[in-house]
Interface confidence: medium
């Protein structure tokens, strides 16, 4: 087991007294059934807490809510419910925080039985609110334009799309029978509409529309649309192919002006596509297998989102609730973890270090034994619990956690064996982006990263007993100290820390309950006195990411370059600080075949780095439709992996000739696109066709 509070561990001196002086309790005197917490701005210390209490009486729901505000990272709260005239705020999508550091907040009130609704707007980090009546009832949370926080978009419960250009002061109806709407870049709005009036029955008969001028004019950019999604610089649409119920993915990189058909298998009505991750370079696309298999195939795209390479087969993605374990490890470039459904129906974790090029099992932690699932007690792997385990009811209180500014650190629940175990999971930590793992904590815990990895905090999950202890580590999870933050245990509901892992404050939320009384309570602990001094140059050490063989000249090369990082020494107990910036030194690598993906019409046989021609395309001219022109491809089978920066070395030749022939990407050709102007406006929003999960860019 991992070192605990024993002689091996360097204990932090006088930590109990230091933490006791910096532990702040706040009691919320209301009986609300739920509490939601929102951070307003970055490094502002402002937190809004909404408590809601709802009771269904006959056909209507009576509810009340209270609003609290903190401006010191949760140490103290002030009841500001009177600022919103004691109005009941919706708990499901009631608080909408503006992008970046705009200081904007929109609260959506629940005005039962009304044809309209009401919002409260703040532009000063929730110090003051202005009440505004809405001419519609929102169906979902009001959406800010990422580029301009004054521009708001809303979908109504009557399938109408509404826009405001002055932060909710005045609203214009853009369109009717809109099923889904999203902000794109440059204040562009994309939406699907159905002239037949229904969003639920007619998927596959939708039209995709775009307005680049907030509703003055509209352009039809696609028809026979089943669904659409945005990922990175790519716009995707799944389009009915005309062959019965089959649909295919089309992709655009110019906001829908031109489309190309993605080289992906078409899917039937019982299947789905899902963008697992996307950036400006490439896309991870999951394509569901036919039938109720619960798995599919991950494909990785080229830089245009058109040519795809098979990345991982039997990828677990349940059709029922849409659970997948796919996780982007943000603390190290190119690393992703997910699960496969093996032939024997067991669930197994896989990891890639090169953006989906190769997948392997996770290395068994040194300090762990293989569990009962292992056929060989010496040979087994670490298996990570994520969304699928949570959905199946296992005691997994948190998803895997990583932060871009806490380089190399990954924290996750897991089990060690041949497959994921249904036994009680433990907490494992990697300090090198998933190459090696250590068992850090026995049993399930809530955890969070503070001060860019300088501190890791955990609270044991204990559903049946109260909680009064917090554990923390200053050496990336090697050693843990325990601090009793209260004498009387609380029913623990969760940890809260400012997004971005730069804060040194952690809030422990829970409630106390007696026969006659129940109330919410928070304990906010500031670790500033534990990390007494600012880190200096001597506290950091040079670390080569992705290093597996220090003797090899190309050691650490991933996607054509290697990176050396300055990382905090485990033995250093100091503050990285709020302004900490990850220091890295990249160096370019020579190209090898590993830096290329197989081009259109080629594939890689298993365990081979060479790309060979697909038998069915041998001897054929490779012609395909790209941006509405027929292209002729001259290739020896390779295309540079998106984001790969290698130079020199192997350099396969590739040429694309424009055949100057018009062609159409199925149903999305430019000539079939219509424009129109709209003097007045009218709009609409319907059912949520595409749900967006925490880590998933787009699921049909």
């Amino acid at each position: 087991s991992a070192p605990g509070e024993d002689e091996e561990c360097g204990r932090v001196r006088d930590f109990v007294a230091k933490l006791a002086n910096n532990t702040h309790q706040h009691i919320f005197n209301d009986l609300s059934g739920s509490v939601s917490l929102s951070w307003v701005g970055d490094s502002t210390g402002v937190i809004l807490v909404l408590t809601t209490f709802q009771v269904p009486i006959f056909m209507i729901t009576i509810g009340q809510s209270k609003l609290y505000r903190s401006e010191d990272y949760g140490k103290n709260f002030k009841d500001i419910t009177d600022l919103i005239n004691n109005t009941f705020i919706r708990s499901d999508f009631g608080i909408a925080i503006g992008p970046e550091n705009s200081g904007k907040v929109v609260l959506t009130a629940d005005v039962s039985g009304s044809h309209g609704s009401r919002i409260f707007r703040s532009s000063d980090f929730a110090k003051n609110f202005v009440q505004q009546e809405l001419p519609f009832v929102p169906l979902m949370q009001i959406m800010y334009s990422p580029q301009n926080s004054d521009y708001l978009l809303a979908l109504s419960n009557k399938n109408e799309l509404w826009v405001s250009k002055n932060f909710g002061g005045k609203w214009e109806k853009l369109y009717d029978t809109v099923c889904l709407a999203k902000w794109g870049s440059d204040n562009t709005i994309f939406f699907t509409a159905n002239h037949n009036g229904s969003c639920s029955n007619d998927r596959g008969m939708l039209e995709l529309w775009r307005t680049s001028d907030l509703g003055k004019s509209f352009k039809t950019i696609g028809s026979k649309i089943y669904s659409f999604g945005l990922g990175g610089r790519f716009l995707f649409a799944s389009v009915m192919t005309g062959k019965g119920t089959l649909r295919a993915i089309h992709v655009s990189t110019d906001q829908g002006d031109t489309w190309s058909m993605a080289q992906l298998p078409p899917v039937g009505h019982e299947q789905f596509y899902s963008i697992l991750a996307a950036n400006d370079d490439m896309v991870f696309m999951h394509v569901d297998e036919p039938g109720d298999s619960g798995f599919g195939t991950i494909f990785t795209s080229d830089d245009r989102g058109i040519v795809y390479s098979k990345s991982l087969e039997r990828h677990l993605y349940t059709t029922t609730g849409g659970e997948t374990d796919f996780t982007n490890v943000t603390s190290l470039r190119g690393v992703y973890i997910t699960s496969i459904l093996a032939e024997d129906k067991s669930v197994q974790s896989m990891i890639t270090f090169d953006q989906g090029g190769r997948w392997t099992h996770l290395r068994k932690p040194e300090n762990s034994k293989c569990d009962a699932t292992a056929r060989d007690p010496e040979k087994c792997s670490l298996h990570i619990h994520a969304a699928y385990s949570i959905a199946t009811g296992l005691n997994v209180p948190m998803l895997p956690l990583s932060e871009p500014n806490a380089v190399g650190i990954v924290i996750a629940h897991g089990s060690v064996g041949d497959a994921i175990s249904v036994m009680r999971p433990d907490v494992y930590i990697s300090d090198d982006g998933g190459y090696s793992w250590t068992k850090a904590l026995e049993g399930p815990h809530h955890y969070t990263i503070l001060d860019s990895g300088g501190i890791i905090v955990a609270v044991e999950q204990n559903a049946h007993q109260g909680v009064n202890q917090i554990k923390f580590s200053t050496d990336e999870g090697q050693c843990w100290q325990t601090y009793n933050f209260t004498k009387d245990p609380i029913f623990f509901t969760g940890l809260a820390s400012e997004p971005g892992a730069r804060s040194m404050n952690i809030s422990i939320w829970g409630y106390r309950s007696s026969l006659f009384h129940q109330y919410w309570i928070s304990y906010t602990i500031d670790f500033k006195d534990i990390l007494e001094r600012n880190c200096e140059e001597k506290d950091y050490t040079i670390w080569l990411a992705h290093s597996t063989d220090p003797e090899d000249y190309e050691d650490g090369c991933i996607l054509g370059y290697k990176e050396q990082f300055l990382r905090l020494r485990k033995s250093s107990v100091c503050q990285n600080g709020r302004d900490y910036v990850v220091t890295k030194q990249p160096s370019i690598c020579l190209c090898s075949l590993e830096d290329f993906l197989c081009d259109f019409g080629y594939y890689r046989p298993e365990n081979d780095s060479k790309c060979v021609e697909q038998p069915e395309l041998k001897g054929h001219d490779l012609e395909f439709c790209l941006y509405g022109r027929e292209e002729h491809l001259t290739t020896n089978g390779y295309r540079k992996i998106p984001g790969d920066k290698c130079q020199g070395g192997v350099n396969p030749v590739r040429e694309v000739k424009d055949l100057k022939k018009k062609c159409t990407s199925n149903f999305l050709s430019p000539e079939k696109q219509n424009s129109k102007s709209n003097g007045s406006a009218g709009g609409s929003g319907g059912l949520n066709d595409i749900f967006e999960a925490q880590k998933i860019e787009w699921h049909e």
Partner: antibody, heavy 117, light 108 residues
């Protein structure tokens, strides 16, 4: 069963006004785009105007723009066509139609509008 | 504006024969084209929408094909009740429509 019943037609002098109504039943009226189509005696069909489900978007054939106004009252399941500055060439049977796909799947029986002095 | 041209203007056939009606658009209308049948004194009846989809209750002898600018309505074997005027109609935008001039199918 879907039913569309037009009313309000009749004889009117050039320059006069009429308001046509179309009462809908048998379907969720507010969910559907609705249109008016006319047919002059012995002639073909001519699309006149269309309105979206919520009433926010409307369009007209060029010859009636500025003179005709399409509207709807979803609480009454009724479609309207307000016709002002009527001309002799507006004489026709006016049909109310429910949109479906690229076409109109249900039509009323029509109401005759005669513009004559 | 998009103009629809129908040909022939009149088609004289006998029951049991195959009828092929053509509709051409002045520019592409994708697959947004519908066909109607109209008998004297009656409202039009939708036969085909979105170029090739049969409307509810329409017999299988009616079929539509084409996309872009050229469309065809085919009646595989004429029944006595099929003699009527047939109109094509396009939807070039969400709320903009135009009809063709019609083709009269009469008994030879």
């Amino acid at each position: 069963e879907v039913q569309l019943l037009e009313s309000g037609g009749g004889l009117v002098q050039p320059g006069g006004s009429l308001r046509l109504s179309c009462e809908a039943s048998g379907f969720t009226f507010r969910s559907y785009v609705m249109s008016w189509v006319r047919q002059a005696p012995g002639k073909g069909l001519e699309w006149v105007s269309t309105i979206s489900g919520g009433g926010g978007n409307t369009n007209y054939t060029d010859s009636v723009k500025g003179r005709f106004t399409i509207s709807r009252d979803n609480s009454k399941n009724t479609l309207y066509l307000q016709m002002n500055s009527l001309r002799a060439e507006d004489t026709a049977v006016y049909y109310c139609a429910k949109n479906w796909g690229s076409g109109f799947d249900y039509w009323g029986q029509g109401t005759l509008v005669t513009v004559s002095s | 504006e998009i103009v629809l041209t129908q040909s022939p203007a009149t088609l004289s056939l006998s029951p049991g024969e195959r009828a092929t009606l053509s509709c051409r658009a002045s520019q592409s209308v994708s697959s947004y084209l519908a066909w109607y049948q109209q008998k004297p004194g009656q409202a039009p009846r939708l036969l085909i929408y979105d170029a090739s989809n049969r409307a509810t209750g329409i017999p299988a002898r009616f079929s539509g094909s084409g996309s872009g600018t050229d469309f065809t309505l085919t009646i595989s074997s004429l029944e006595p009740e099929d003699f009527a005027v047939y109109y094509c109609q396009q939807r070039s935008n969400w709320l903009i429509f135009t009809f063709g001039p019609g083709t009269k199918v009469d008994i030879k």
